[in-house]
């Protein structure tokens, strides 16, 4: 048995048919000795008497508030909630596999830039009776701080017959140095509580491999005179990290037909403006990616061709 | 104490609203839920609204139900009611332990009609 | 989300015991209800939490189980037990809410 926070417990069980399960020994927190006695959540039935309660823990039945009284006047609570690990894996029934880019991965996060601030965000169908705490660091041995804000809901989505509901989270280095070769991962670890039952979530990561640029701005197209060319011209995102010089960009420009089953014709640059021909009823389209790492393409930013 | 009323025969079509009038407690501790019983069929959940006022719906509801509270009632307006909405509604008080909750205090019902 | 209740309808002597369970389509860990409801009456609620007993329900009524299997049973039956009993799944409003079809019990 752990300590969440102030007067909430976790008990860490193995989880199959009859275990055993935990004796914990819960104290009521008074200076108080005689007279004491204990009920559970809104029952009123008297559990036992005197300045401790021992219990055996097995189930969810088992967990919960647990209230020490004298004279009907409450003294103490300790919320007692479960942690269930099943042929040695912890539970993980409160987040939705998301699946991408790989199996079991139930946080995702991305960086819109080096400054060290970063979002991450997960998925359930649970709607009620649930709570998140965020905590991250970069390396776990020695960490050094960052400071993420309240996980809130961001999204809310109807999957046949049931909602998907997205949370979300922000995150800043406290001494971020968007130059600097990372050496230790950003941990960050999500504790997530839904009625009796506790889970955590950990994602680890370097800056470099969450980033996705925001789309390029001012996407605009000038036509060539004499010719079914255009020139198609854009800016760095305005959150990209500066300067632009050093944290540089590469660009991939397509020209998309009203169909999609029509050949789209691409052009990577590294600068900030292309040639290309536009089509009638064709749509050009413009994403930016890190140019000396690979990692995400940023969304599209698109005009169309007309 | 949990009743019910506002339940009578109305046309197809026709919006109703149903009331769940409460006393010895506060709305504000507790989840309320809205069920309905077709003559000689089982227990259908409609549609919860919790002790902050967030409302959460079955999935077969689509819209046609909506619940509301003030500090003493709790509303279910029927917007398009059918003959297929003919049932008992009953209203019932949870546990206050959770926003998902079970129900100890149930009303009486109130009977509504759906026929032309 | 289903919960599935079975039997329908069960038939039993005065002082003999009755089962029934209930199954639900997704684990709901021990967010089970139990109610007994008479002809023209509301539900009553019997049990919560799968096993715990509701304030001044007789101790012949006893709920177990967990995840998706939870049975009712009903011991030394009184004629005052001929009723429909409903499970109801409290887990969450939008991924496990609801009640199973019903049970009849009839005391003969």
């Known amino acids: 048995i752990w300590e969440l926070k102030k007067d909430v417990y976790v008990v860490e069980l193995d989880w199959y048919p009859d275990a055993p399960g935990e004796m914990v020994v819960l104290t009521c927190d008074t200076p108080e000795e005689d007279g004491i006695t204990w009920t559970l959540d809104q029952s009123s039935e008297v559990l036992g008497s005197g300045k401790t309660l021992t219990i055996q823990v097995k189930e969810f039945g088992d967990a919960g508030q647990y209230t020490c009284h004298k004279g009907g006047e409450v003294l103490s609570h300790s919320l007692l909630l479960l942690h269930k690990k099943e042929d040695g894996i912890w539970s993980t029934d409160i987040l939705k596999d998301q699946k991408e880019p790989k199996n079991k991965t139930f946080l995702r996060c991305e960086a819109k830039n080096y400054s060290g601030r970063f979002t991450c965000w997960w998925l359930t169908t649970i709607s009620t009776d649930l709570t998140f705490s965020v905590k991250s660091s970069r390396g776990s041995s020695d960490p050094q701080g960052v400071t993420c804000g309240a996980a809130t809901l961001s999204a809310e989505r109807v999957r046949g017959d049931n909602k998907e509901y997205e949370y979300s989270v922000e995150c800043q280095e406290d001494s971020a140095c968007p130059a600097a070769e990372e050496s230790l991962p950003i941990e960050v670890m999500v504790d997530a509580v839904h009625k009796l039952k506790y889970e955590n979530y950990t994602s680890s990561f370097f800056i470099r491999d969450i980033i996705k640029p925001d789309p390029p701005k001012n996407l605009q197209l000038k036509p060539l005179k004499n010719s079914r060319q255009v020139e198609v011209s854009w800016e760095y995102p305005d959150t990209w990290s500066t300067p632009h010089s050093y944290f540089s960009l590469t660009f991939c420009v397509q020209v998309q037909g009203k169909s999609k089953r029509e050949k789209k014709d691409r052009v990577f640059t590294d600068k900030t403006s292309a040639t290309v021909i536009c089509r009638k009823n064709a749509s050009i389209s413009v994403r930016a990616q890190d140019r000396y790492y690979s990692s995400s393409w940023s969304e599209w930013a698109s005009v169309p061709c007309s | 104490s949990v009743e019910e009323s506002g339940g009578r025969l109305v046309t197809p079509g026709t919006p109703l609203t149903l009331t769940c009038t409460v006393s010895?407690?506060?709305?504000?501790?507790?989840?309320m839920i809205w069920v309905r019983q077709a003559p000689g069929e089982g227990l259908e959940w409609i549609g919860i609204?919790?002790?902050?006022?967030s409302a959460y719906y079955a999935s077969w509801v689509n819209g046609r139900f909506t619940i509301s509270k003030t500090s003493t009632t709790v509303d279910l307006k029927m917007t398009s009611p059918t003959t297929g909405d003919t049932a008992t509604y009953f209203c019932?008080?949870?546990?206050?332990?959770?926003?998902?909750?079970?129900?100890?205090?149930w009303g009486p019902g109130t009977l509504v009609t759906v026929s032309s | 989300f289903e919960l599935t209740q079975t039997p329908s309808s069960v038939e039993a002597a005065v002082g003999g015991t009755v089962t029934i369970k209930c199954q639900a389509s997704?684990?709901?860990?021990?967010?089970l209800a139990w109610y007994q409801q008479k002809p023209g009456q509301p539900p009553k609620l019997l049990i919560y939490?799968?096993?715990k007993l509701a304030t001044g329900v007789p101790s012949r009524f006893s709920g177990s189980g967990s995840g998706t299997q939870f049975t009712l049973t009903i011991s030394d039956l009184e004629c005052a037990d001929a009723a429909t009993y409903y499970c109801?799944?409290?887990?969450?409003?939008?991924?496990?809410?609801?009640f199973g079809g019903g049970t009849k019990v009839v005391v003969v």
């Open positions: 609204i919790s002790a902050g006022g």
């Open positions: 939490s799968a096993s």
């Open positions: 010895g407690f506060s709305l504000s501790s507790y989840t």
């Open positions: 997704q684990s709901i860990d021990s967010w």
């Open positions: 109801q799944s409290y887990y969450d409003a939008n991924a496990g809410y609801g």
């Open positions: 019932a008080r949870g546990s206050g332990t959770y926003t998902s909750d079970y129900f100890n205090i």
